[in-house]
Structure formats: C-alpha cells, structure tokens
C-alpha cells in the first residue's frame, strides 16, 4: 500500500530513508536535457524474497537535443519556487547502512540522472530528519517519521524536531511547535489497527546510524 | 499546438458530486502521466491525484483518498477526476497537468509537469 501523502515537512530540515520497504518506487528521472528512452521503465521497484531485496528494472537516459524542450503552454496556477528536496536527495550510501529484511538500499547512480530523486514509499517505511546547514536540532521526541496505516488511511508520524538559527537566542522561536500528532494519543483510545510493520528494527537500527545518516551536504 | 482544457466544474452543495473532464489536444494521453491540482483562493497550489498512463502507480493526496477518483481514457485522449462527497473545503479552480514521466505527487510537486490547462471552479455550498 502507497503511502498517500508525502512526510512532513519541518522548516530548514531534509529528511533521508536509510533502506526502502519492498514495494517502494523510484521515478526514472533524467536531467535537463535527457529524457527516458522510449521502451524504458517509467519506474525502479523494489522487490524481493524473505533473504534478499533488490531494484527491478533499469533506469535509462538518452539524449534528447533533438526535441523542443520548452514545453508549459499556459502559466502555471502559481509559479512554483525552485523546489529544495526532500525525499528527492541526491543519491548517497551510509557506511554502515545495515541490510534490514524486506528493504533495499538506495539504489546506484544512473548515467544522466536528474539531481532529485523522487519516491513512492509504502506503509512502514520510516524516514529520517536532520536540520540543514546553519540551523540546530531542538529535540522534543524522535526526529523520525513512520507512514502508518490507520483506519483505511495512511498518514505519517509528526517527527518531534524544531530546527533553530545558531543565532536564535529564544529556545522555541515564534512558538513553532510540531503539529499535534495523533501519536499523543494512547493506543487504546483508538479502536483501530495501526500498522507499523518493522517499525521496532528501524528504530534499533537508528541508534547506530545515528552519526553516519547524514553524511553529505545537500544543495 | 498542445492543450488541455478541463470542464465539468459548477456549483454543488456538500455531500454532493462533480466530474471533471481534461481534453488534451497535441499530446498522446497514452504515454503521459495525467494529473489533478487545485488551488484555493489564498492558498498555494495542493495536489489532488494523479496517474501514470500503465497504470502502475495512482496517488491521491490524503485529504480525497477514498472520496476522489482519478481516471483516465487513453484513446479518447481525455482524463477525468470524479469527485464524491463533496466538502466545502473541496472549493477551489482544479487544474489538470500531464508530464511525460512518471507520477509526481506531494506537497510541491507541481513543478515537474509540463503542460496545464487554465483550471475550472468549483465552488460547494454548505
């Protein structure tokens, strides 16, 4: 089941998934100046067994110098500022990126590939966040965020983090606070399943990724 | 010369149902990905649904799943998004956009598609 929406956002912070849940797609993206090539995948699909998970299909660029690339034909309803990249990073593999069952690592560089990466998470996939450059962690819980499945829907889990200026003196600026989560809520006030498949090994296997998650600057 | 032209917006009261169709003229529905956005007055851009021409991946944002339907005629080159239990928060001039690549979804994704039509209203009373 596809995630319906994408992971929070939290003001001057990124987030990165250190493995993918078998179900996952990647788009096969090319940058400007490429397009897929006409029998190619439209997505990459992670798949697999109980002892082994990998990237189905092969994303492929070629050339496309040859046709006109300008293509809006109306204004867009609101022009869209350059967007920063959230679960479209740029491809990196953690040193000690463990292999969790059912879940694959990022997948490898594709020759002209586009500079974000965009994903289709599925229910259980948990995604990691961590302030950009020039701003500091202000932790109120885990800075993580899990997509669940409650009631039919799929939501994601409001990760606990505020990110602050280094110059910010105030320890909440401008009251930021988290949205309420539903995750204040006891289990037991909700009369519903809540599905967080592998939910307990990504969070053990946060503690020891914890210096090495982000280990390259983003643009 | 490429065009996408959405109809089938008007008045409804809540609870009720619209369907809104995109003709496209100068594309091939049938090798790009169709997509619904919409726009409140005051409000950014918010993705609706969307679709891939294989049919591979559809998305819905969160706050239609369930209520929306994204669909699509490859031959008759049209797209349609039918759209039950109507809420006035549903208000809004909706968008269709088609790109050739796969499905973008989310809370800024309307940058990656290519081409737009000039959106329709609709507007739920209570």
């Known amino acids: 089941e596809l995630c319906d929406d994408d992971p929070p956002e939290i003001p001057h912070a990124t987030f990165k998934a250190m493995a993918y849940k078998e179900g996952t797609m990647l788009n096969c993206e090319c940058k400007r100046g490429f397009r897929r090539i006409k029998s190619g995948s439209l997505y990459m699909l992670c798949t697999g067994n109980s002892s082994h998970s990998s990237w189905d299909n092969q994303c492929q660029c070629t050339s496309s110098a040859t046709r006109n690339t300008t293509k809006q034909v109306t204004p867009q309803p609101e022009e869209q500022k350059e967007r920063k990249t959230t679960e479209m990073q740029s491809p990196m593999q953690p040193v000690d990126q463990a292999s969790l069952p059912g879940h694959c690592r990022e997948p490898p560089p594709w020759e002209n590939e586009a500079t974000e990466r965009i994903y289709h998470f599925v229910v259980g996939q948990m995604v990691y966040y961590q302030c950009v450059q020039g701003y500091r962690a202000l932790h109120r819980g885990p800075a993580e965020s899990v997509c669940k499945m409650t009631h039919g829907k799929t939501r994601w889990t409001q990760p606990q983090l505020i990110c602050t200026g280094e110059m910010e003196t105030s320890q909440f600026p401008g009251e930021e606070k988290p949205q309420a989560s539903p995750e204040g809520r006891p289990e037991s006030e909700t009369s519903c399943l809540v599905t967080t498949t592998d939910f307990q090994i990504q969070t053990e296997m946060a503690a020891t990724m914890e210096t090495s998650i982000f280990t390259t600057e983003y643009q | 010369e490429v065009q996408l032209v959405e109809s089938g917006g008007g008045l409804v009261q809540a609870g009720g149902s619209l369907r809104l169709s995109c003709a496209a003229s100068g594309i091939t529905f049938n090798d790009h990905t169709m997509a619904w956005f919409r726009q409140a007055p005051g409000k950014e851009r918010e993705f609706v649904a969307a679709?891939?021409?294989?049919?591979?991946?559809?998305r819905y944002a969160g706050s239609v799943k369930g209520r929306f339907t994204i669909s699509r005629d490859n031959a008759g080159n049209t797209g349609f998004l039918q759209m039950n239990s109507l809420r006035p928060e549903d208000t809004a001039v909706y968008y269709c956009?088609?790109?050739?690549?796969?499905?973008?979804?989310?809370?800024?994704?309307?940058?990656?598609?290519?081409?737009w039509g000039q959106g329709t209203q609709v507007t739920v009373s209570s």
């Open positions: 956009a088609a790109r050739e690549g796969g499905v973008v979804a989310g809370v800024r994704s309307g940058a990656p598609y290519d081409y």
């Open positions: 679709r891939d021409w294989s049919d591979i991946i559809t």
